[in-house]
Amino acid sequence: GSVKVLHEPSCFSDYISTSVCQWKMDHPTNCSAELRLSYQLDFMGSENHTCVPENREDSVCVCSMPIDDAVEADVYQLDLWAGQQLLWSGSFQPSKHVKPRTPGNLTVHPNISHTWLLMWTNPYPTENHLHSELTYMVNVSNDNDPEDFKVYNVTYMGPTLRLAASTLKSGASYSARVRAWAQTYNSTWSDWSPSTTWLNYYEPWEQHL
């Protein structure tokens, strides 16, 4: 039978080394055996490159393409092939479709005056455009109470957040995770970092009375 694309490729770039395209076929497909995504930078002399897609689900394919350190002018021509049959053709400008890398190494440390210090690492090296463009969202949730959660927007430069222990329930176990966004690139949010968990042992002041 004929091979058809149900949802055409949607692509995002981490704006440093990788672009990822995902699409959905109209029926379960062995992506790596049946399909190829070719990509070529619209730049004089550039070569045509081929990406072998992998299955994310039965009919969903994903392709990770190594790219050079992206610049705003870069535009790629993309062609999705099933053998000799061209299924889809389009263009992709990484600077217009940025999905930042996931922040790393989220840790929680007790700090002075009953505060918790949450720290994580900026996923970009200092020389990359995005290093100084990231803002973060930190989600803090009570492991035993789904209603007890807080969201903090970190819009200053440093990848840190100070959290008053008193804003959390005493004796409860909390988990935090962080994601990043690049405002000037109108990016999507990054994936959430892995969660880190800690016990909030703050003792409310009333108990001292």
């Epitope: 730049f43 004089m44 002399g45 550039s46 070569e47 045509n48 705003e72």
Partner: antibody, heavy 125, light 112 residues
Framework: EVQLVESGGDLVKPGGSLRLSCVAS????????MTWVRQAPGKGLQWVSL????????YYADAVKGRFTISRDNAKNTLYLQMNSLRAEDTAVYYC??????????????????WGQGTLVTVSS | DIVMTQTPLSLSVSPGETASISCRSS???????????LDWYLQKPGQSPQGLIY???KRASGVPDRFSGSGSGTDFTLRISRVEANDTGVYYC?????????FGQGTKLEIK
């Protein structure tokens, strides 16, 4: 040492054909785009054509489009320029030159960093 | 197509002086910050051209530091300081950004 040696230049009548060759050595030929540039007697330099490292993409000056064909044989480290329907205004010294490194996603540019000695093509009746 | 305009078309300089050649393009040759696709070439009498400067300011291998390139966007300059008799020849700028590649008309440098 990088070397480019052109050959194939000759006296040919208008409407005739000629094939120029450029044999390369001293660098990884397949990794680089190659370019042909010509120079009419007493005139300036004129870009003619470019081919990327794999041979999969070619570019031409408007003056030669449809008449000239650039190609390469990476196994023989050789660049070619097939010239058909030649005209008097095609009379020139033809140089081959090493252009950008194309094995990277975005070609790395060093200008035309090495040139051959040139071969003379004369189109006259 | 991008048009390249070189000035002056001829230049006479005494040894030890500085020579400056200008090249202007009809469109920006900046692909990204720091990447201006403008080259300078020298063709000495009876020889093949040789590369001097690429990407606007980078010296080709073996080129003395007396040769320097500057500029961005559409305006570029080649400066030759402490000019020597050996620098005589025709200097060309060329845009390497997009097809068709194009050379300037050339500047003939004569040493007095």
């Amino acid at each position: 040492e990088v070397q480019l040696v052109e050959s194939g230049g000759d006296l040919v009548k208008p409407g005739g054909s000629l094939r120029l060759s450029c044999v390369a050595s001293g660098f990884t030929f397949r990794d680089y785009a190659m370019t042909w540039v010509r120079q009419a007697p007493g005139k300036g330099l004129q870009w003619v054509s470019l081919i990327n490292g794999s041979g999969g993409k070619t570019y031409y000056a408007d003056a030669v489009k449809g008449r000239f064909t650039i190609s390469r044989d990476n196994a023989k480290n050789t660049l070619y320029l097939q010239m058909n329907s030649l005209r008097a205004e095609d009379t020139a010294v033809y140089y081959c030159a090493v252009d950008r490194l194309t094995k990277t996603i975005r070609p790395q540019y060093y200008g035309l960093w090495h040139w051959g000695q040139g071969t003379l093509v004369t189109v006259s009746s | 197509d991008i048009v390249m305009t070189q000035t002056p078309l001829s230049l006479s300089v005494s040894p030890g002086e500085t020579a400056s050649i200008s090249c202007r393009s009809s469109q920006s040759l900046t692909y990204s910050i720091g990447y201006n696709y403008l080259d300078w070439y020298l063709q000495k009498p009876g020889q093949s051209p040789q590369g001097l400067i690429y990407l606007g300011h980078k010296r080709a291998s073996g080129v003395p530091d007396r040769f320097s390139g500057s500029g961005s966007g559409t305006d570029f300059t080649l400066r030759i300081s402490r000019v020597e008799a050996n620098d005589t020849g025709v200097y060309y700028c060329m845009q390497g950004l997009q097809s068709p590649l194009l050379f300037g008309q050339g500047t003939k440098l004569e040493i007095k």
